[in-house]
Structures are given as C-alpha cells and as structure tokens.
C-alpha cells in the first residue's frame, strides 16, 4: 500500500499586513480515514490553527470543502493577516481514533508578514 | 486576561505521590501548548514537563517515568501527576503557558512542593 | 541537550547605569533565545523572545541582541524595579526546553 503523503508546496509564502494568506495544503490518499489539523510551530507550544472537528477559527476558513467526499484539498485562507500571524505552518493528518492519532505532518510553510504599502 | 492558578502543593515523603492542578482563563486552553517548570530553593528554573494543545507529552529525563503531565481541554486545566517522589523534586512548581514558538509567555504564582522525610 | 552558561553570576550596578547580561549556548540555537525576569517571591516574567523581540508591554530600555550561540540582554538606565535575576532560555531545541542558571542584577 502506498504511504501517505502530506504535501505543502510552498516552503515560504509573504503577505502584506491586511491581506489574506493562502496556505496550501493536499494529502496522496483518503486512506487512512481521520482529520487534518494546521498548526502554527512544532514541539510542545504548537498553536491549533484549524481544526474542522471542533473549535471557533473565525479568522480562518477551508478553501474547499473538506466535508466533500473524495476531497483532498485542505488548505486554509488566513484572512487579515497581521504580524503576529508570521511562523511555520504545518498540516498534520490524524487518524481517526479516541483519541485521534498523528500520522504524518506536512514539511511546513513560513508565512512572513510584510508591512502594508503606504 | 490570561490567569494560570495552580493548586495541589504540600509537604510529602520520599516515595509518596502528589497531582497538581493549573486552572487556566483568558485563552482558548485547548489550543495551545502547557508546561510546568520548576524552581528548587535558591536555585535556577528547570523545564519539567510540556503537553501540547493536541496532547502529544514531553518531559525532562529526571522525571520521566515518574511524572505524568494531562490535561482536561474541557475544564481548561493542566495536572502533573508525580510519584515516586525524592528530595530533590522539592521546588516551586509552575504552570506556564507556552507560545508557538516554544517559549513561555505567561506564568502561574506556583506551588509548593515539599518532599521531606 | 542544549546548555546555557549566563555570565556573570551576580552584577552589581548603580541605579541610571547600563547593565550587560551575557548568554552563552553550547551549539547554535538559531536566534532562538529568550530572556525572563524574576523578582524574589514572584514568578518569572518573559522580556524578550527571538533574541530581540520584546514581549508585550515591556519597557524599551530592556534590549536584546546576539546569533549563533552568543547573546546579551542590556538594560540601559536601570531602575529600582529592574533589580532581579535575569535567566536566558533557548526555544530551539524542545528536547529539553533549558534555560540559563541566571544572572542576579544587585544594586552597587
């Protein structure tokens, strides 16, 4: 069976204070079944970012719908974006468990915050 | 405002077991990295134990395997479950929250604990 | 494990004057460097974070500088509320988080 693959394309992404960052995310197979997560760092102070299971993310939403079947498209739109929001993005797959269990985590995008234009 | 209230502290023996508690307000606790760090009398800080907001566990060689960190996203509250306790676990206990980016932002007033025979 | 050696021990100062806290890491931590204040009796409090980043609401005399595995905390014009222990913590390395066996600012 051919293991899964969590891809982010973009090692680095830069937005202008304001705007909104795309953080792109796909996985190789639906299989196993269980959540993506995105969080922001790794190690013990990794901050949830999305989690579609549970949760109040209003600055964030899904590009697609990752309720859809089939989908496996779960990247993210951060919107007003702020220099508080730089850091390394990861998406992280789970299987589906009590609790869910991590599977795999993607290599990560660092989002830089660029001073909005005068 | 961010509050972390710790609790649980006291005086025990050598071997006995002892769980702390950390009440957290003013973020969404379940989000976000926890830990406890110690402080020996008249000495430094030492990082003991960190659970992240997904509930993956670390800790420092000199407590694993005695020391349990959890938490209860539902109740916005850390626990150090510590046993096999010694003499040398005698320290101000901290409760801290940690940052994305795997420092400590803010801090608990700490609780004592005492292992003494 | 990654080990922080802060210098000097203690630091005597006058009041108005600048104060140099030294920290000294055993491998490179990448800028990844905070430094936290703590007054007797109280908890410690973070100042800065990513070698140069002050934390929220903290004033601009406390600054920090510094790469690879060298980096200063400087206090310029010291106040009364300034005299404390200073520790250094890398957030590099999460295993283990380790801090500095600090450095005890006094007044001269």
């Known amino acids: 069976e051919e293991e899964l693959q969590v891809i982010q394309p973009e090692k680095s992404v830069s937005v202008a204070a304001g705007d909104s960052a795309t953080l792109n995310c796909t996985v190789s197979s639906l299989i196993p079944v269980g959540p993506i997560q995105w969080f922001r760092g790794a190690g013990p102070g990794r901050e949830l970012i999305y989690n579609l299971k549970e949760g109040h993310f209003p600055r964030v939403t899904a590009v697609s719908d990752p309720t859809k079947r089939n989908n496996m498209d779960f990247s993210i739109r951060i919107s007003n974006i702020t220099p508080a929001d730089a850091g390394t993005y990861y998406c992280v797959k789970f299987r589906k468990g009590s609790p869910d269990v991590e599977l795999k985590s993607g290599a990560g995008t660092e989002l830089s915050v660029r001073a909005k234009p005068s | 405002d961010v509050q972390l209230v710790e609790s649980g502290g006291g005086v025990v023996r050598p071997g006995e077991s002892l769980r702390l508690s950390c009440a957290a307000s003013?973020?969404?606790?379940?989000?976000?990295?926890m830990s406890w760090v110690r402080q020996a009398p008249g000495e430094g800080l030492e990082w003991v134990s960190a659970?992240?907001?997904?509930?993956?566990?670390y800790y420092a060689d000199s407590v694993k395997g005695r020391f349990t960190i959890s938490r209860d996203n539902s109740k916005n509250t850390l626990y150090l479950q510590m046993n096999s306790l010694r003499a040398e676990d005698t320290a101000i206990y901290y409760c801290a929250k940690v940052t994305w980016n795997n420092f400590f932002d803010y801090w608990g007033l700490g609780t004592l604990v005492t292992v003494s025979s | 494990e990654i080990v922080l050696a802060q210098s000097p021990d203690t630091l005597s100062v006058s009041p108005g004057e600048r104060a140099t806290l030294t920290c000294r890491a055993s491998q490179d931590v990448a800028g990844k460097l905070a430094w936290y204040q703590q007054k007797p009796g109280q908890a410690p409090r973070l100042l800065i974070h990513?070698?140069?980043s002050r934390a929220d609401g903290i004033p601009a005399r406390f600054s920090g500088s510094g790469s690879g595995t060298e980096f200063t905390l400087t206090i310029t014009g010291l106040q009364s509320e300034d005299f404390a222990v200073y520790y250094c913590?890398?957030?590099?390395?999460?295993?283990?988080?380790?801090f500095g066996g600090g450095t005890k600012v006094e007044i001269k």
């Open positions: 913590q890398q957030h590099y390395d999460w295993s283990p988080l380790t």
């Open positions: 990513a070698t140069s």
């Open positions: 003013g973020f969404t606790f379940r989000n976000y990295g």
């Open positions: 659970s992240s907001g997904s509930g993956s566990t």
